[in-house]
Interface confidence: low
C-alpha cells in the first residue's frame, strides 16, 4: 500500500492532459502581506479573497486591502475592491460570512482613531456591498444570530453590547460592561457584565444575564461568575464557590432557568476547565491539575451535563498557548485523538472509539519500523502530531484531517515509537477510523478531501518553490504527481470548499512571475479525472467499528452497529456533490459498557461493575438537582450518551435514596456548602476560545 | 553587470514576420519576468509583451495579440519575440526590459529598430 | 485602456530640486501600480531608475527618488545636474492591462 507509483499502482491514463484543461490560473495585482479566504453559500461557487498589507506606524496601523470575488470556485477572480470604496478591512475579523445560505457577508474597516466604525455589508453573496457607519468600534467579530441573519451583535471596545436587527443599518446600545456575549439558541443572547467594575479585574465577581427578547428586558440568572460556555445543549458557567479563590462548574439545560454542580474538581486561580466537545448528549471536559503541569484530566459527562466519568489522565493542555491535540475523528463515531503527557516528559497519542470510554494507544502501522523512541524495537505506535506539535514549530504543516462524508478516513502527521518524534514527520492514514493505519507519504504534506473521499491532494511542504501536485483516487494507496505549472511557486495554502464535496482544489501562494512576489492561485478542477458518475456497483458494505467478525456484537459501540456503503478503492468515478452517506444501523444488546457509574459510584480497574466510592459512605452527597430540595436515587448505574442499546443486561440493583437539602441557586450562591473534591486548572487567560481548534470553551 | 543585447531587427514588407533576441546576462534571468517594449517613431513607449519566469504565462496588448509570441529560453538566458502579419504601425525600436515589481529595479536593453515598410 | 499623462516639459537649474509626476485616468496611483520610472538619453539609451514606485536600481544616484504624492506617482530629483537634462517615462502596472507608459517629460537643465 500507498507506494507512490509503485509497483501495484497503474497510472490514470491521459491525466496529465485531463488535468491540464482543467487547471485555471490566476494572477493577482497584489503583493499583500495576506489572504483571508472565504466561500459565501454553499454549492454556490462564490469565494471572496481578502488581500491586507498593513504597517503598523507609532500607535496606529495603515495598510490597504484588496477584495476579490470568484463565482466559479476560483477559477476567475474579479478584483472588486471598488465595491468596497478602496477601505482597508480589518483583517483580524476576517470575512464575517452569514449562517447558512443566506448569502450575507460583513467586513469591519479600520477607521483608526475615529469614534465610530464602518462596516460594508452584503445580501447578494458578495456581489454588492453597501456601507454603514457604526456608533461604535467593534472589539471583534460582529456575530449573527444563527437563526436569523439580519439580526447581529457586537461587543466594543469600551465593553458595550450592541444589537441590529436590520443587518446593520440601525445599531441599539444594549448593555455596559459586557465582558463576553454568545448566542444562544432561538435568538437567546447570553452574556456577563460587571455591575460596578470592568473586565479586566474582578472577574470572578461578574454577572451572567440573558435576554430572549433582543435586549427589551433582561434575566440575571447567574452571579459571582467568572466565565462561562455553550455547548450542545448544555449552558456552562465557572462560579466563585465562596472559598475565597476556587470555582466550580454549574450546568444548565434550561438556558439558565434552573442549574445544577457539575461532579467535577473545583479549580484555583491558576487552573482551568475546558470543554474539548460537545453535543446535545454529553460532553468533554478538560480539567487542569494544580501547578505549570501542562496537563489535567478529561471527564465525560451524563446526559445531565452533571455526573462525570474520569476519561484520560495526565492530559497535555498547555497553559501557556492553550494547546490541546484532542480532535474530534469525524469520518466515525466515537471516535476521538488526543495526546497524553507521560510521567518521562514524553508525549503520546491516545485513541478512544467508544466516546471516553476508554483510550488505547495507536496501532503501529504494518509498513513502518519503529524510530529511535521505541525501547523495543517490534512493539511501538503510531503517535499523531496535532496542535501542540504545531504550536512547538515541528515540521508538521497540518493537523489531522477527518470528514463526516469521507467515512471511515483520517489523514494525519506521525512518527512510529514509544513517543512523539521530533524528527520530519510522514503522513499516515486511516481508513476505518483509527483502527488500523498506513504510511501514505514520505515527508510532511499539506492535504485535502474532495467528492467526499473519491480523491485525496496532497503538497509537499517545502522551503522551495513547488508546481508539482499528488492526487490519488483510492484513499491514498497510490500517488500520482501533476506539475500544475512550469512556474514553481511560493506555497502558501491549499484551498477547498469546506464539506469535502467539491472536487475543485485551489493552491495559493505567490510567484516572482511578472513583479516580484504576486499572490497567485491555480484552481484545478478533477471532474476529469473522476469521469462517470458512481453506481451501485461502485460501493461496498463496510462494518464500522469491526474488530471481531466472528463476535455476533462486532461493531457495537454505544449500543448499535452501523453498516456504510462505501466507494471500493478501485472505483475511479464522482461522488458529486449529492452524495449522501448511506449507512444502515442496528441496535446492540446491552451490556455493563453500555452504562456509566452514576455519582458516588466508580469503576475498580478491570471491572466492569459499578461499585458505592468508600470515600463518600456514610456523607451526604454534595450535589444539588434542579436547584431545590431533591431526593436523589439512584442504583448507581446510567445509560451513556447517545446509547442506543436494548435488551440484554440491565443492571437493576437495591435504589439507594442519598438525601442533601441544598440550594444550588446561583443568584444567592453564598448559600452552597460545596466542599471540593479535588482541584484541576489552566491559564485563566482571557481568551474565548470558542470555535478555535474546535474547542467548544476554554474560560 | 546587467546587460541586455537585442538583435533580430531589420526591414521587412507588411504581413511579413521577424524574430527578436535578447541575450541576458549579469543577473539570475530565470528569477524575473520580463517584457518587450516598443518606442514608436512619435517618441512614444508601448508594452509589446510580458512573459513570467518561468515561461508559462504571456499578456499582450490588443494591437499586438495574437500575431506577437514572446517565449524564453533560460537554459541560454535569452528571451524572443516572434513577430509575424507585421503592419507599418509595428515600425518601433524594440526594447528588451527588465520591468519590475517591489523589490527589483528595472533594467533595459541598447534595443532593435524593425521597419515594417513595403 | 488607462491612460497615464505626464508633465510634457519641466526646466530646472542645477542644484534645484525638481519634481516629475505621473498620473493615472483611473483613480489614485497606489503602491500596487508598482510606478517604474525610466530615463532616456539620446541615441535610444534607456536606463531604469526607480521600480516599483521607491526602489532605486542599482548604480543610480542617490538624488533619484520615487514615491506617491498625493494620488500621483512621483520622480524627484534633488539638486539636479546638467546630466540629468532627458526625457522621463513613467510606467505603471494594471491588473488587467499590464505595463502602461505615460508620454514621456523633456526635463531640461539649465547650465
Known amino acids: 500500500r500507498s507506494t507512490e507509483q509503485g509497483e501495484s499502482c497503474s497510472g490514470l491514463l491521459g491525466a496529465d492532459a485531463k488535468l491540464a484543461g482543467n487547471t485555471h490560473q490566476h494572477i493577482f495585482n497584489d503583493l499583500s502581506g495576506s489572504v483571508s479566504l472565504a466561500w459565501v453559500g454553499d454549492g454556490t461557487g462564490v469565494i471572496l479573497a481578502l488581500t491586507t498589507f498593513q504597517v503598523p506606524i507609532f500607535m496606529i496601523t495603515i495598510g490597504q486591502s484588496k477584495l476579490y470575488r470568484s463565482e466559479d470556485y476560483g477559477k476567475s477572480f474579479e478584483d472588486v475592491t471598488n465595491l468596497i470604496n478602496n477601505t482597508f478591512i480589518r483583517s483580524d475579523f476576517g470575512i464575517a460570512i452569514g449562517p447558512e445560505n443566506s448569502g450575507k457577508v460583513i467586513l469591519t474597516a479600520d477607521v483608526s482613531g475615529s469614534h465610530g466604525s464602518r462596516i460594508f455589508v452584503s445580501s447578494d453573496f458578495g456581489k454588492s456591498f453597501t456601507h454603514q457607519e457604526l456608533p461604535f468600534v467593534p472589539l471583534m467579530q460582529i456575530t449573527y444570530n444563527p437563526e436569523n441573519s439580519n439580526v447581529l451583535l457586537a461587543l466594543s471596545n469600551k465593553n458595550e453590547l450592541w444589537l441590529s436587527e436590520d443587518f446593520g443599518t440601525n445599531w441599539k446600545k444594549l448593555y455596559d460592561t459586557v465582558c463576553l456575549a454568545k448566542w444562544g439558541r432561538k435568538g437567546t443572547i447570553f452574556f456577563t457584565a460587571n455591575h460596578n467594575g470592568s473586565c479586566s479585574n474582578d472577574r470572578g465577581m461578574l454577572e451572567l444575564e440573558r435576554t430572549t427578547d433582543y435586549g427589551k428586558s433582561f434575566k440575571t440568572v447567574a452571579s459571582k461568575i467568572y466565565s462561562f460556555g455553550l455547548g450542545g445543549k448544555f449552558l456552562f458557567a465557572s462560579v466563585m464557590t465562596g472559598k475565597g479563590t476556587l470555582r466550580a462548574i454549574h450546568v444548565s439545560v434550561d438556558d439558565g432557568d434552573t442549574w445544577n454542580m457539575a461532579q467535577l474538581p473545583s479549580v484555583g486561580q491558576e487552573q482551568f476547565y475546558s470543554i474539548l466537545a460537545a453535543n446535545d448528549d454529553m460532553v468533554f471536559m478538560h480539567v487542569d491539575e494544580p501547578g505549570d503541569t501542562g496537563f489535567g484530566t478529561i471527564f465525560t459527562s451524563d446526559d445531565r451535563g452533571i455526573v462525570y466519568s474520569k476519561s484520560l489522565d495526565r492530559h497535555l493542555y498547555t497553559t501557556t498557548g492553550g494547546e490541546t491535540d484532542f480532535t474530534n475523528v469525524t469520518s466515525l463515531r466515537g471516535v476521538y485523538i488526543t495526546s497524553v503527557l507521560s510521567e518521562d516528559n514524553s508525549i503520546q497519542t491516545m485513541i478512544t472509539f467508544d466516546q471516553g470510554g476508554r483510550w488505547t494507544h495507536l496501532r503501529k502501522p504494518e509498513n513502518s519500523e519503529c524510530d529511535a523512541t521505541a525501547k523495543n524495537k517490534n512493539e511501538c505506535s503510531l503517535h499523531i502530531h496535532a496542535s501542540y506539535s504545531i504550536s512547538q514549530k515541528l515540521n508538521v504543516p497540518m493537523a489531522p484531517l477527518s470528514e463526516p462524508n469521507a467515512v471511515g478516513i483520517v489523514i494525519a502527521h506521525g512518527s512510529v515509537g514509544d513517543a512523539i518524534s521530533v524528527m520530519v514527520p510522514d503522513v499516515y492514514i486511516s481508513d476505518d477510523g483509527g483502527y488500523s493505519w498506513t504510511k501514505m507519504l514520505e515527508g510532511p504534506h499539506y492535504y485535502t478531501i474532495l467528492d467526499s473521499g473519491g480523491i485525496i491532494v496532497a503538497i509537499e511542504h517545502s522551503s522551495r518553490p513547488i508546481n508539482v501536485i499528488k492526487f490519488s483516487t483510492d484513499e491514498g494507496q497510490c500517488w500520482q504527481t501533476y506539475t500544475f505549472t512550469r512556474d514553481p511557486i511560493y506555497f502558501t495554502g491549499l484551498a477547498s470548499e469546506p464539506g469535502a464535496r467539491s472536487m475543485n482544489i485551489s493552491i495559493w501562494g505567490f510567484t516572482e512571475s511578472f513583479l516580484t512576489s504576486q499572490w497567485v492561485s491555480y484552481t484545478i478542477d478533477f471532474k476529469d479525472i473522476l469521469e462517470r458518475n458512481c453506481e451501485e456497483k461502485d460501493y461496498t458494505i463496510w462494518l464500522a467499528h469491526s474488530t471481531d467478525p466472528e463476535d455476533y456484537e462486532d461493531g457495537c459501540i454505544l449500543g448499535y452497529k452501523e453498516q456504510f456503503l462505501r466507494l471500493r478503492k478501485s472505483s475511479v468515478c464522482q461522488n458529486g456533490r449529492d452524495y449522501v452517506v448511506t449507512k444502515q444501523p442496528s441496535i446492540c444488546l446491552c451490556s455493563l459498557e453500555d452504562f456509566l457509574c452514576d455519582f458516588g459510584y466508580y469503576r475498580p480497574e478491570n471491572d466492569s461493575k459499578c461499585v458505592e466510592q468508600p470515600e463518600l459512605k456514610g456523607h451526604d452527597l454534595e450535589f444539588c438537582l434542579y436547584g431545590r430540595e431533591e431526593h436523589l436515587t439512584t442504583n448507581g448505574y446510567r445509560k451513556i450518551p447517545g446509547d442506543k442499546c436494548q435488551g440484554g443486561v440491565n443492571p437493576v440493583r437495591e435504589v439507594k435514596d442519598l438525601k442533601k437539602k441544598c440550594t444550588s441557586n446561583f443568584l444567592s450562591p453564598e448559600k452552597q456548602n460545596s466542599k471540593s473534591n479535588g482541584s484541576a486548572g489552566g491559564s485563566g487567560g482571557l481568551n474565548d476560545i470558542f470555535e478555535a481548534q474546535k474547542i467548544e470553551w476554554h474560560e | 553587470e546587467v546587460q541586455l543585447v537585442e538583435s533580430g531587427g531589420d526591414l521587412v514588407k507588411p504581413g511579413g514576420s521577424l524574430k527578436l533576441s535578447c541575450a541576458a546576462s549579469g543577473f539570475t534571468f530565470s528569477s524575473y519576468g520580463m517584457s518587450w517594449v516598443r518606442q514608436t517613431p512619435d517618441k512614444r513607449l508601448e508594452w509589446v509583451a510580458i512573459i513570467s519566469s518561468g515561461g508559462s504565462y504571456t499578456h499582450y496588448p490588443d494591437s499586438v495579440k495574437g500575431r506577437f509570441t514572446i517565449s524564453r529560453d533560460n537554459a541560454k538566458n535569452t528571451l524572443y519575440l516572434q513577430m509575424s502579419s507585421l503592419k507599418s504601425e509595428d515600425t518601433a525600436m524594440y526594447y528588451c526590459a527588465r520591468l519590475c515589481g517591489p523589490l527589483c529595479s528595472g533594467y533595459w536593453g541598447q534595443g532593435t529598430s524593425v521597419t515594417v515598410s513595403s | 485602456q488607462a491612460v497615464v499623462t505626464q508633465e510634457s516639459a519641466l526646466t530646472t537649474s542645477p542644484g534645484e530640486t525638481v519634481t516629475l509626476t505621473c498620473r493615472s485616468s483611473?483613480?489614485?496611483?497606489?503602491?500596487?501600480?508598482?510606478a517604474n520610472w525610466v530615463q532616456e538619453k539620446p541615441d535610444h539609451l534607456f536606463t531604469g531608475l526607480i521600480g516599483g514606485t521607491n526602489n532605486r536600481a542599482p548604480g543610480v544616484p542617490a538624488r533619484f527618488s520615487g514615491s506617491l504624492i498625493g494620488d500621483k506617482a512621483a520622480l524627484t530629483i534633488t539638486g539636479a545636474q546638467t546630466e540629468d537634462e532627458a526625457i522621463y517615462f513613467c510606467?505603471?502596472?494594471?491588473?488587467?492591462?499590464?505595463?502602461?507608459f505615460g508620454g514621456g517629460t523633456k526635463l531640461t537643465v539649465l547650465g
Open positions: 483611473t483613480g489614485a496611483v497606489t503602491t500596487s501600480n508598482y
Open positions: 510606467a505603471l502596472w494594471y491588473s488587467n492591462h499590464f505595463w502602461v
